[in-house]
Amino acid sequence: SLDCDLPQTHSLGHRRTMMLLAQMRRISLFSCLKDRHDFRFPQEEFDGNQFQKAEAISVLHEVIQQTFNLFSTKDSSVAWDERLLDKLYTELYQQLNDLEACVMQEVWVGGTPLMNEDSILAVRKYFQRITLYLTEKKYSPCAWEVVRAEIMRSFSSSRNLQERLRRKE
């Protein structure tokens, strides 16, 4: 079994991230209905049971790293409260560290593969669609609000994978 206690630490960090994303809201999503967009979150990559533990951790890491990238751009720092952004960065960084520590040990268990490339690429393309949307909308307040709500949804959806990790512990 792993020395690290991924499910508890990760679930706590996950909850704190969700709370911070909720607190970051600046305008009502209802005033941005015309800006709604289907980013096609790759739910199937989080629902299947095909993952080895290291692969699942890599997919979770991808979601968190891409979220960190999204909110650490110059455009993001203009759009959001700096104090809340710093708290979000701290939370995301801690989760990345937890996942990294776990995967470093996990790759030794039977020489498990580190990734399912299709899953990683699906997550990448999802975040590329988000970035493209923000660019097309010229990083408007409504566009950022739509994206904030979408990221909350993606974090919520990735919970299934975390739950299965907990059961594999």
Partner: antibody
């Protein structure tokens, strides 16, 4: 693609301090660490430490703790290396280096150096 | 702390020949965390191989990485004139993050 541009060469006296800067441009993210790696004349590469610009979180190699300070500005994205109590053996080319956001999966991204600065020669001489 | 030992120190070969460079770790390193770089005189290092065996963008397929545990290799199937340089292996360990380089292998023209 990320470009890293370091400050110019410096000549320093033993016991003094040096500050080297590294400005990042291109597809940069403050969510990825910037490291400092040095190379003494005719020698190999030695990792000194890194900083995550988004948070200012630093990690230093054991050999340099107590004499090294790495800081960063988020805009424009710039990392700074300060090395104090300089000795003759600190004469080296100092490189800044960063990962690539394109590495798949991202969990490998921060384990390597995809982009390097041109290097900044620091000479310690009396 | 992990120590990486590269061998041989220098390799004298002719263009067209193959080269095998060794990198031995003092303790187990996951192949995912083993990286190779190439450095030519007066230039900054260049990323060649990461994750043990994945080629970085723009790296020709004559370069390949392999190995596991404590023994890793960089193979150049057929040396081109532009390949002659110093090659470094590097490992990563966390937490806390530590990057370790081997001392390098120089591949020179015979």
């Amino acid at each position: 693609e990320v470009q890293l541009l370091e400050s110019g060469a410096e000549v320093k006296r033993p016991g003094s301090s040096v500050r080297v800067s590294c400005r990042a441009s291109g597809d940069t993210f403050s969510s990825y660490p910037i490291s400092w790696v040095r190379q003494a004349p005719g020698q190999g590469l030695e990792w000194m430490g890194r900083i995550l610009p988004a948070l200012g979180v630093t990690n230093y190699a054991q050999n340099f703790r107590g004499r090294i300070t790495i800081t960063a500005d988020k805009s424009p994205l710039t990392a700074y290396l300060e090395l104090s109590s300089l000795r003759f053996e600190d004469t080296a080319v100092y490189y800044c280096a960063s990962p690539s956001a394109d590495i798949i999966p991202s969990i490998l991204g921060t384990t390597l150096f995809a982009f390097w600065g041109q290097g900044s020669l620091v000479t310690v001489s009396s | 702390e992990i120590v990486l030992t590269q061998s041989p120190g220098t390799l004298s070969l002719s263009p067209g020949e193959g080269a095998t460079l060794s990198c031995r770790a003092s303790q187990n390193v996951s192949r995912h965390y083993l990286t190779w770089y190439q450095q030519k005189p007066g230039q900054s290092p260049r990323l060649l191989i990461y994750g043990g065996s994945s080629r970085a963008t723009g790296v020709p397929d004559r370069f390949s990485g392999g190995g596991s545990g404590t023994d890793f290799t960089l193979t150049i199937s057929r040396l081109e004139p532009e390949d002659f340089a110093v090659f470094y292996c590097q490992s990563y360990h966390s937490p806390p993050p530590v990057y370790t380089f081997g001392q390098g292998t120089k591949v020179e023209i015979k």
